[in-house]
């Protein structure tokens, strides 16, 4: 059974996936952002169902395409490289969702673009976490 | 409603110039990409070029790199295509269209090239 | 550089189902927009972001890709949807727009 201080050690690490998975939110729907609607035309695959941690997996899956595609706007849109933003969502990913576990994420029949994918992920981090609380 | 507006086109010879110009309304053109997009006679559609919104990116079809120009003009409303050196398969109908990916489109200005 | 492709021609009887191909490369990572032009008319929008219907196209109209393939169907297929139909994406970069070569669609 998940003790308190590793449900504790789980929510601090969703909090921050939230806080980087805005941060990129806001980062390319800004209005000063030239790239948005190119960017628009990437599509990102959403998960069937997301409701667990292990759900995750589909996410990592699909942090390489992310990075690609903020390649594309301008930096100073973000505190950081994407290279360095998208490492930074891996290795969170990677201890939520546990690395021994192998789970195979199935994908939904439905693409999204990138603030549809971003908004997802953001919504599975906020009903985690409040089921946490 | 949206609407765009084409004009200049016309019979020029081989080695010409033309400039087309597209007058746009109805929309807030400055927050969107234009494009043109030509079609030869019974053919099918060819993207031209396109612009973001303050003209600081511009990509263009190989077969028109170095000839053709695209610009607009945020204060007028207006998208230009400064087409030089033109050849005989530069003969086409061009439509002024709104968007990166494309919602809209005028009724387009016939360009013939021949001598 | 970059290719769309279509086949150039699809028949159905009114009431059928068409469907129209396009393959491209960049399709798995792209999204594909349709266009519908009809004889001496401009173009018209019927499909974008491979799924999505523009408001005021009829119901019949949809879209779905798998893989390098995207695919307008039109489901009962009338007398007036009879016309050319374009598919349209961009490169893996997003530099490159393209149009497919087109499909006439006759509905007999």
């Known amino acids: 059974a998940p003790t308190s201080s590793s449900t504790k050690k789980t929510q601090l690490q969703l909090e921050h996936l939230l806080l980087d998975l805005q941060m990129i939110l806001n980062g390319i729907n800004n209005y000063k952002n030239p790239k948005l609607t190119r960017m628009l035309t990437f599509k990102f695959y959403m998960p069937k169902k997301a409701t667990e941690l292990k759900h995750l997996q589909c996410l990592e899956e699909e942090l390489k395409p992310l990075e690609e595609v903020l390649n594309l706007a301008q930096s100073k849109n973000f505190h950081l490289r994407p290279r360095d933003l998208i490492s930074n969502i891996n290795v969170i990913v990677l201890e939520l969702k546990g690395s021994e576990t192998t789970f195979m994420c199935e994908y939904a029949d439905e693409t999204a673009t990138i603030v549809e994918f971003l908004n997802r992920w953001i919504t599975f981090c906020q009903s985690i976490i409040s089921t946490l609380t | 409603q949206v609407q765009l507006v084409e004009s200049g086109g016309g019979l020029v010879q081989p080695g010409g110039s033309l400039r087309l110009s597209c007058a746009a309304s109805g929309f807030s053109f400055s927050t969107h990409w234009m494009t043109w997009v030509r079609q030869a006679p019974g053919k099918g559609l060819e993207w031209v070029a396109n612009i973001n919104q303050d003209g600081g990116e511009k990509y263009y079809v190989d077969s028109v790199k170095g000839r053709f120009t695209i610009s607009r003009d945020n204060a007028k409303n207006s998208l230009y295509l400064q087409m030089n050196s033109l050849r005989a398969e530069d003969t086409a109908l061009y439509y002024c269209?709104?968007?990166?990916?494309?919602?809209?489109w005028g009724q387009g200005t016939t360009v013939t090239v021949s001598s | 550089s970059y290719e769309l492709t279509q086949p150039p021609s699809v028949s159905v009887s009114p009431g059928q189902t068409a469907r129209i191909t396009c393959s491209g490369d960049a399709l798995p990572r792209k999204f594909a927009y349709w266009y519908q032009q009809k004889s001496g008319q401009a173009p018209v929008m019927v499909i974008y972001?491979?799924?999505k219907r523009p408001p005021g196209i009829p119901e019949r109209f949809s879209g779905s890709s798998s893989g390098t393939m995207a695919t307008l169907t039109i489901t009962g297929a009338q007398v007036e949807d009879e016309a050319d139909y374009y598919c349209y994406s961009t490169d893996s970069g997003g530099d490159v727009s393209v149009f497919g070569g087109g499909t006439k669609l006759t509905v007999l």
């Open positions: 269209a709104r968007g990166y990916t494309i919602s809209d």
């Open positions: 972001e491979d799924s």
